[in-house]
């Protein structure tokens, strides 16, 4: 008799996920030699311990601590860039500008980055079939724990000046929701963090509106200046010529607003 | 090879402060976390917390908040600890730990006596 | 915070005898689970982490195994120079907690 399972209303945990989870690891250990220490079959063994055998509507960040400690990693705190809902131009960025880092540059968001988790209740399998979705389901699931718990911690690491990378196209181009607005916002440190520049990424070529006037960007800034950090905008109108400009500074046209 | 040494034995007034050091060497200190614990004469091991030198960050056992406050300065990497309002009590033996960022105590200092008497 | 009960307190044992000493944890803590020896008047050493794995230069007459909440420690073939207090340590939450200690002599 088959046993029941639950059945959740987002994707099951994503196909070979401890195969991939260890794999990564152990490429980026050796590409970054400040982390070859990292003994990565410990760290699959406390990211697997976090939420095997565990409901998974009933994680803990306390869960994930044995996987925080064994992942530590200390990036340049000047050099940090968040992101809200335009990941890709993020990465790209960094891959380009090296001295800067993403969260998923770092070892515990390398290894995270695009998968889906969870375990059963009081059984040692990982559930392929469905996961808990965060709005309908559970915002306590393993996925949504984890990346709170790692947004935090970065957020909490940060300093002097902190960049984000925010969405134009978007209708709430910062969103109190986001992971940006809702967990890192909070968590950067007013006593080391001298600034948020956020950079607005316009969507349409021909789109040439100050979005630093957005209403949702005032609201962020209202949020930042009451945690007395100073707060600035940049419209970034031409993403594609700004990647460009990043890779060659010394280009003519780099000189002009992009 | 890691080596954590630390500062000589002290013997301080109920009431006094003290502050003890623990030089890192063999590795990249601001990598990695210190551990400090405290072991009073003939009894057990009681983890007080830890610093992680690059970014400062801390985590104390909720016993030991307002008596430990925990530092570190990166640039002759070396940890401190200093305890406050001492009393009988704090007399014992403090040992840092580290390196590794692991789960367990790897290497040790080799433990600094504290002694509280009028 | 995660209470570790080691047992017994204290043992004595023969020269060549193998002794188990226990450690339980309150909650389960996976396998976060090393144990130390303490020899008088010096400093803890590692001798296991992560439940059963030996530390770099421990002999192998040093085992441990266990996880979730049950853990044991064994020495077979006792010498005399295993003559210490062995303490248990979980690494699964903050505060990290210890045992309260085995000490061990020989009869």
């Known amino acids: 008799v088959p046993r029941w399972r639950q059945q959740w209303s987002g994707p099951g945990t994503t196909k070979r996920f401890p195969e991939t989870v260890l794999a990564r690891c152990v490429k980026y250990t050796e590409i970054h030699p400040e982390m070859r220490h990292v003994d990565c079959q410990s760290v699959w063994d406390a990211f697997k311990g976090a939420f095997i055998s565990k409901h998974p509507c009933n994680i803990t960040e306390e869960d994930y601590q044995p996987l925080m400690k064994l992942g530590t990693q200390t990036v340049p705190c000047n050099k940090i860039l968040l992101w809200s809902r335009i990941k890709d131009l993020a990465h790209q960025f960094t891959q380009v500008q090296r001295d800067m880092f993403t969260l998923e540059d770092t070892l515990l968001g390398y290894l995270a980055d695009d998968l889906t988790w969870c375990g059963e209740f009081n059984t040692s399998k990982i559930n392929y079939q469905s996961c808990p979705d965060w709005r309908k389901d559970c915002s306590n699931n393993p996925v949504s724990v984890f990346w709170k718990t790692v947004s935090r911690r970065f957020a909490e690491a940060a300093c002097d000046v902190v960049h984000v990378m925010l969405n134009g196209s978007r209708s709430k181009i910062f969103d109190k929701n986001s992971t940006f607005g809702s967990v890192e916002v909070h968590n950067l440190q007013p006593e080391k963090v001298q600034t948020l520049e956020a950079w607005v990424i316009h969507g349409g070529r021909e789109d040439s509106r100050d979005l630093c006037q957005d209403p949702t960007i005032k609201e962020l800034e209202s949020i930042i200046s009451k945690r007395n950090i100073q707060f600035s905008c940049k419209n970034i109108y031409r993403p594609d010529k700004f990647l460009q400009c990043v890779k060659n500074p010394e280009d003519s046209s780099c000189t002009s607003e992009i | 090879q890691v080596q954590l040494q630390q500062s000589g034995a002290e013997l301080v007034k109920p009431g006094a402060s003290v502050k003890i050091s623990c030089k890192a060497s063999g590795y990249t200190f601001s990598n990695y976390w210190i551990e400090w614990v405290k072991q009073r004469p003939g009894l057990g091991l009681e983890w007080i917390g830890d610093i992680l030198p690059g970014s400062g960050t801390t985590n104390y056992n909720e016993k030991f908040k307002g008596k430990a406050t925990f530092t570190a300065d990166t640039s002759s990497n070396t940890a401190y600890m200093q305890l406050s309002s001492l009393t009988s009590e704090d007399s014992a033996v403090y040992y840092c730990?580290?390196?590794?960022?692991?789960?367990?105590?790897?290497?040790w200092g080799q433990g600094t006596l504290v002694t509280v008497s009028a | 915070d995660i209470q570790m009960n080691q047992s017994p307190s204290s043992l004595s044992a023969s020269l060549g005898d193998t002794i188990t000493i226990t450690c339980h944890a309150s909650q389960n803590i996976n396998v976060w689970l090393s144990w130390y020896q303490q020899k008088p008047g010096n400093i803890p050493k590692l001798l296991i982490y992560?439940?059963?794995n030996l530390h770099t230069g421990v002999p192998s007459r040093f085992s441990g195994s266990g996880s979730g909440t049950g853990f044991t420690l064994t020495i077979s073939s006792l010498q005399p120079e295993d003559i210490a207090t062995y303490y248990c340590q979980q690494g699964q939450s903050y505060p990290y907690t210890f045992g309260g200690g085995t000490k061990l002599e020989i009869k």
């Open positions: 992560k439940a059963s």
């Open positions: 730990a580290g390196y590794g960022n692991y789960l367990w105590f790897t290497y």
